[in-house]
């Protein structure tokens, strides 16, 4: 005869475990139903009655099958230097990531705890390593024959234009100035940019009213064991 399917709650056979989506209740000494993601246990099972589950209340969630008495609280609203890439729902916590132009200086299990503005390389310095979602920009001095005349977190050092006759020689922060109207070779006008990390925004987000002013977090951050690279600015 085929074995009968046991309905929760039931006493497990000695040495056996409860089935998937069930848990062993020590008090009742029975296998009982877990609650689904988005729910929590309102009433624990007894020998004669199964777990009673309730829906997670506003701004709380459970991501897994569970028998917790209360759902977990969603994290606080994203700060002004962040974007909400995943909204708080019954089944998932809110995730905040840094907005463009910022990077995550202190991460957490999901998302970012503390964002900081990407370093800007001052004139005479260009971007050696672009910023990412989790790392700051690294600046380097412009090598001879190259320059950067901007304060930017994306501009690299560009070659000086080559003149037939040089009026003013170029330096690390200024392009060469030619006497003739047309140089032999020049770079395309405009600064050369490196791509910035882009935060992806999920389709379902909850609007977060931003405060009109938010203090900069950059002063809170240690810049590592050594002082910041020369040629960087804090803002």
């Amino acid at each position: 005869l085929p074995a009968q399917v046991a309905f929760t709650p039931y006493a497990p056979e000695p040495g056996s475990t409860c089935r998937l989506r069930e848990y062993y209740d020590q008090t009742a000494q029975m296998c009982c139903s877990k609650c689904s993601p988005g729910q929590h246990a309102k009433v624990f099972c007894t020998k004669t009655s199964d777990t009673v589950c309730d829906s997670c209340e506003d701004s709380t969630y459970t991501q897994l099958w569970n028998w917790v008495p209360e759902c977990l609280s969603c994290g606080s609203r994203c700060s002004s230097d962040q974007v909400e890439t995943q909204a708080c729902t019954r089944e998932q916590n809110r995730i905040c990531t840094c907005r463009p132009g910022w990077y995550c200086a202190l991460s957490k299990q999901e998302g970012c705890r503390l964002c900081a503005p990407l370093r800007k390389c001052r004139p005479g310095f260009g971007v050696a390593r672009p910023g990412t979602e989790t790392s700051d920009v690294v600046c380097k001095p412009c090598a001879p024959g190259t320059f950067s005349n901007t304060t930017s977190s994306t501009d690299i050092c560009r070659p000086h234009q080559i003149c037939n006759v040089v009026a003013i020689p170029g330096n690390a922060s200024m392009d060469a100035v030619c006497t003739s109207t047309s140089p032999t070779r020049s770079m395309a006008p405009g600064a050369v940019h490196l791509p910035q990390p882009v935060s992806t925004r999920s389709q379902h987000t909850q609007p977060t009213p931003e405060p009109s002013t938010a203090p900069s977090t950059s002063f809170l951050l240690p810049m590592g064991p050594s002082p910041p690279a020369e040629g960087s600015t804090g803002d």
Epitope: G38, S55, D58, S59
Partner: antibody, heavy 118, light 106 residues
Framework: EFQLQQSGPELVKPGASVKISCKAS????????MNWVKQSNGKSLEWIGI????????SYNQKFKGKATLTVDQSSSTAYMQLNSLTSEDSAVYYC???????????WGTGTTVTVSS | QIVLTQSPALMSASPGEKVTMTCSAS?????MYWYQQKPRSSPKPWIY???NLASGVPARFSGSGSGTSYSLTISSMEAEDAATYYC?????????FGSGTKLEIK
């Protein structure tokens, strides 16, 4: 377009049962929880319960436990609510409504009028 | 369960007039949600997370409040705003609705 189409009006006798349906169109049925709400005689609204189609689990308002049973048929993207042991107190318009995983009913069905009369 | 009390139950306003209706909760709630319902129609989502307007809701509507006291305001009444408005919470199970404020046009 995101819509919830409910079954037509029902006239039932006291003590009988009725099963009303709510068919979802143009969205992934299992991604949205389905709630049922009662509105008696144009008055206020009462939440009956919720079903999570992805998991088949339910939560009920204590007041409607034993009165309402919520089920889903994923193959037809349809949610059902069965009402048992009907009395005149159960005469109302019943709505299905999705909540998108949040705590707010963002799409409502067309409503089903249930009249209990001998 | 949390009881939501809406006031006034019935009000009328002239076109262009500012309208404010309130929703008071018996216990503190995290957010309030609002719906508009017209006769022989299903409720429509109107305001969510206390102050965010649902899609298609005119900018003359606004929502505010915290704790146990919330309100819906229309900056300048229009004829199409005549309807019944319900508040709703889900900070505690079961979710509950207010008894509604019926807004008429003068």
């Amino acid at each position: 377009e995101f819509q919830l189409q409910q079954s037509g009006p029902e006239l039932v006798k006291p003590g009988a049962s009725v099963k009303i349906s709510c068919k979802a169109s143009s969205y992934s049925f299992t991604d949205y929880n389905m709630n049922w709400v009662k509105q008696s005689n144009g008055k206020s609204l009462e939440w009956i319960g919720i079903i999570f189609p992805k998991y088949g689990t339910t939560s009920y308002n204590q007041k409607f436990k034993g009165k309402a049973t919520l089920t889903v048929d994923q193959s037809s993207s349809t949610a059902y609510m069965q009402l048992n042991s009907l009395t005149s107190e159960d005469s109302a318009v019943y709505y299905c409504a999705t909540d998108g995983g949040t705590w707010y009913f963002d799409v409502w069905g067309t409503g089903t009028t249930v009249t209990v009369s001998s | 369960q949390i009881v939501l009390t809406q006031s006034p139950a019935l009000m009328s306003a002239s076109p262009g007039e500012k309208v404010t209706m309130t929703c008071s909760a018996s216990s503190s709630v995290t957010y309030m949600y609002w719906y508009q319902q017209k006769p022989r129609s299903s409720p429509k989502p109107w305001i969510y997370l206390t102050s965010n307007l649902a899609s298609g809701v005119p900018a003359r509507f606004s929502g505010s409040g915290s704790g146990t006291s919330y309100s819906l305001t229309i900056s300048s009444m229009e004829a199409e705003d005549a309807a019944t408005y319900y508040c709703q919470q889900w900070s505690s199970n079961p979710p509950t609705f207010g008894s509604g404020t019926k807004l008429e046009i003068k």
